[in-house]
C-alpha cells in the first residue's frame, strides 16, 4: 500500500488516503455513468471479505476496452500484493454468478465506504 502513489507521488500514501481515493474514483464512475458502463459487460461476483481487492481486480481485469474502469483497475492493483492477469480466479469469486460491471462497482463502493468508516484499510 505504501507504493500506491506511483512515480508522481511525493512520498508514501497512507492506507486511509489510498482507500479514500479508490472510493472517490468509484463514486466518479457511478455518477458519470450515462450509457451502460463498459457496454453492459458481465463480471464474476465476488465475496466481499478478506482478499477482496485481489478478487475484485481478477474480476475487472477480464473487462477489456473499457476506459471508464482503467484507473480503478490500476488502483486495485496497488491493494493486491500479487500480480493479477486476465483469466485468473480466486476462491473468492462466486463462480456461478455474473453481474453487470455497474452493479459490481456499486456493491464494491458500498463495501469500501463502510471499511473506510470502520478504519479497515488493509
Amino acid at each position: 500500500l505504501t507504493c500506491l502513489g506511483g512515480f508522481a507521488s511525493p512520498g508514501p500514501v497512507p492506507p486511509s488516503t489510498a482507500l479514500r481515493e479508490l472510493i472517490e474514483e468509484l463514486v466518479n464512475i457511478t455518477q458519470n455513468q450515462k450509457a451502460p458502463l463498459c457496454n453492459g459487460s458481465m463480471v464474476w461476483s465476488i465475496n466481499l471479505t478478506a482478499g477482496m481487492y485481489c478478487a475484485a481486480l481478477e474480476s475487472l481485469i477480464n473487462v477489456s476496452g473499457c476506459s471508464a474502469i482503467e484507473k480503478t483497475q490500476r488502483m486495485l492493483s496497488g491493494f493486491c500484493p500479487h500480480k493479477v492477469s486476465a483469466g485468473q480466479f480466486s476462491s473468492l469469486h462466486v463462480r456461478d454468478t455474473k453481474i453487470e460491471v455497474a452493479q459490481f462497482v456499486k456493491d464494491l463502493l458500498l463495501h469500501l465506504k463502510k471499511l473506510f468508516r470502520e478504519g479497515q484499510f488493509n
Epitope: P14, L19, R20, L48, L110, H111, K114, R117, E118, G119
Partner: antibody
C-alpha cells in the same frame, strides 16, 4: 421520502422483555448503518448499538451487551431491538437513527421514538 | 469508553445573545481514517434530535449560518452567533469516532 418509524414500546414488568421495531422506508437499509439511541425521561441521549444490515456487523455499548440485541430483516427493510431483563432504569424513549449514505458521517434521519416504561 | 463532558449544563440567554457551548472528550476523537466525527445535535421537548454540525465544523444542509462549530483534538465548541426564539432547546455533542459512541450530557439553553 426517507422515514424511520419505531413501534413496540409500552408498559412492561421488571424482569420482562420487549422487542422494539424500526420500519424504514425511502431507502434500503443495506446501504447504510442503523443505530438505536435511548433517552430516559428528563435525561440525556445514550447510544445503544449499531448494525450494518448488509453483513450483520454489530457493535454495542458494553453497557448494553447481553441486555440488548440488535437485528435486521432486509426483506422487510426493518430493524429490531430486543430488550431483556428490563429494570426501572431502562424506562426511556428509544429512537432508531440512520447514518447518512455518502460517508456515514452522521445521523441524518431519526424516528419519532417509542416509549418503554418498566414498572410493576 | 470516551467521556464527552459538556459545559455549561444549562444557561439562560436573551434573543440576540451570542452563546457558546463547549464539549471536551476524555481522549482524542480523531478516527484512524483521519476524520474527527464530532457532531452537535439540537433537541426540543418531545422531539427527536436534529443534526446541526458534523465533523467538527460542517453545517448540515438547512441549518442557519448563525450556528458554527470549531475545535480539534479534545476540545470543541458550538457557537450560536445571535440567539433566535426557535433556538431555545437542549444541545448535545456526540463522538462517532470510537465505539462505543458517546453523547455529551447536554446543555439546556433557556430564555432569560
Amino acid at each position: 421520502e426517507v422515514q424511520l418509524v419505531e413501534s413496540g414500546g409500552g408498559l412492561v414488568q421488571p424482569g420482562g422483555s420487549l422487542r422494539l421495531s424500526c420500519a424504514a422506508s425511502g431507502f434500503n437499509i443495506k446501504d447504510t448503518y442503523i443505530h438505536w439511541v435511548r433517552q430516559a425521561p428528563g435525561k440525556g441521549l445514550e447510544w445503544v448499538a449499531r448494525i450494518d444490515p448488509a453483513n450483520d456487523n454489530i457493535k454495542y455499548d458494553p453497557k448494553f451487551q447481553g441486555k440488548a440485541t440488535i437485528s435486521a430483516d432486509n426483506a422487510k427493510n426493518s430493524l429490531y431491538l430486543q430488550m431483556n431483563s428490563l429494570r426501572a432504569e431502562d424506562t426511556a424513549v428509544y429512537y432508531c437513527a440512520r447514518s447518512e449514505e455518502n460517508w456515514y458521517d452522521f445521523f441524518d434521519y431519526w424516528g419519532q421514538g417509542t416509549l418503554v416504561t418498566v414498572s410493576s | 469508553d470516551i467521556q464527552m463532558t459538556q459545559s455549561p449544563s444549562s444557561l439562560s440567554a436573551s434573543v440576540g445573545d451570542r452563546v457558546t457551548i463547549t464539549c471536551r472528550s476524555s481522549q482524542s476523537i480523531v478516527h484512524s481514517n483521519g476524520n474527527t466525527y464530532l457532531e452537535w445535535y439540537q433537541q426540543k421537548p418531545g422531539k427527536a434530535p436534529k443534526l446541526l454540525i458534523y465533523k467538527v465544523s460542517n453545517r448540515f444542509s438547512g441549518v442557519p449560518s448563525r450556528f458554527s462549530g470549531s475545535g480539534s483534538g479534545t476540545d470543541f465548541t458550538l457557537t450560536i452567533s445571535s440567539l433566535q426564539p426557535e433556538d431555545f432547546a437542549t444541545y448535545y455533542c456526540f463522538q462517532g469516532s470510537h465505539i462505543p459512541y458517546t453523547f455529551g450530557g447536554g446543555t439546556k439553553v433557556e430564555i432569560k
